[in-house]
């Protein structure tokens, strides 16, 4: 039986330019996590698996970077960048959980409320 | 250099059985899941079964299930796979194949025949 | 089960041409389909990755596309040692799944 929770940062904003860390946080659970992929739309981003560590895609390699965690940090933000995020946890023995953030990445003079999800 | 290799294979009657053994060198084998796959004699591949990198885990193709066992021994680096009730139709020869991040399959073994026939 | 259906079966083609094939599934897989080249008696050959990844050691001359439902393996320019069959693979899911295969032959 699956009784845990995934906790995201739900929806969220970020400067264009800028950067941002997606975050998941599964809980209520004693499964073992084995691997964490996160996806974009039908992109897959990363991967992080405990015994292999972070897999990031190569395509996105320049703008995606591991952690801190289980996160992921998404940098050099463009507006095509704006759009559903999901974090996918492979647990044992429960199963797969997912967690599901949206992103919208706009111009900075609008993007005030999502400057606390900033990196300095 | 990463290195898998099967034996195990043969000619065996229909209702028979066999152990397939893929030794693995070359990597931190408990650090990666595995599959076998297996191809008919003139056919394309078809997955048959699949193992975490601890073993806890495991998941098979309808066609094999109850019938084959997928196992593992990490302190020997060695994967296994137990045919029971073999068929005419198992007959193929059969891969064992590395799967990091249980994604893709980056290394495979040359392959062992297996026969099933009276 | 997810089918993965791919097209064409076979082809003939030159030395220096562009090939192109395709593979659908049954449902949207995300990015997870993986592309593998056999020759007669190999065992097969990983040459993409999770869509659009070229694995490491592969010639440049490949490349992948797609995501959810449609894919594309390319080969820029075809070399005589490209003459084999391609796969396309989907492990979004188990049972895990090849497509039918693709020969490409000399013409």
């Known amino acids: 039986m699956m009784t845990g929770t995934i906790e995201t940062t739900g929806n969220i904003s970020a400067e264009k330019g800028g950067s941002i860390i997606l975050q998941c946080h599964l809980s209520s659970t004693t499964a073992q996590v084995t691997q964490v992929n996160w996806e974009q739309q039908d992109q897959l981003l990363a991967i992080c698996n405990a015994d292999l560590g972070w897999h990031i895609s190569p395509s996105f390699k320049d703008r995606v970077a591991p952690g801190p965690g289980l996160g992921l940090t998404l940098q050099s933000l463009t507006v095509n960048d704006t759009g559903e995020y999901f974090c996918i946890y492979h647990t044992y023995p429960d199963g797969t959980y997912t967690g599901r953030i949206f992103l919208e990445v706009l111009e900075s003079s609008v993007a005030e409320h999502g400057a606390r999800f900033q990196i300095p | 250099e990463v290195q898998l290799l099967e034996s195990g294979g043969g000619l065996v009657q229909p209702g028979g059985s066999l152990r397939l053994s893929c030794a693995a060198s070359?990597?931190?084998?408990?650090?990666?899941?595995m599959h076998w796959v297996r191809q008919a004699p003139g056919k394309g591949l078809e997955w048959v079964s699949g193992?975490?990198?601890?073993?806890?885990?495991?998941s098979y193709a309808d066609s094999v299930k109850g019938r084959f066992t997928i196992s593992r021994d990490n302190s020997k680096n060695t994967l296994y796979l137990q045919m029971n009730s073999l068929r005419a139709e198992d007959t193929a020869v059969y891969y064992c194949?590395?799967?990091?991040?249980?994604?893709?399959?980056?290394?495979w073994g040359q392959g062992t025949l297996v026969t099933v026939s009276s | 089960d997810i089918q993965m259906t791919q097209s064409p079966s076979s082809l003939s083609a030159s030395v220096g041409d562009r090939v192109t094939i395709t593979c659908r599934a049954s449902?949207?897989?995300?990015?997870?389909l993986n592309w593998y080249q056999q020759k007669p008696g190999k065992a097969p050959k990983l040459l993409i990755y999770?869509?659009?990844s070229l694995q490491s050691g592969v010639p440049s001359r490949f490349s992948g596309s797609g995501s959810g439902t449609d894919f594309t393996l390319t080969i820029s320019s075809l070399q005589p040692e490209d003459f084999a069959t391609y796969y396309c693979q989907q492990s979004y899911s188990t049972p895990l799944t090849f497509g039918g295969g693709t020969k490409v032959e000399i013409k």
């Open positions: 193992i975490s990198s601890n073993g806890g885990s495991t």
């Open positions: 999770a869509a659009s």
């Open positions: 070359g990597f931190t084998f408990s650090s990666y899941a």
């Open positions: 449902q949207s897989i995300s990015s997870y």
């Open positions: 194949a590395r799967v990091p991040y249980s994604v893709w399959a980056d290394y």
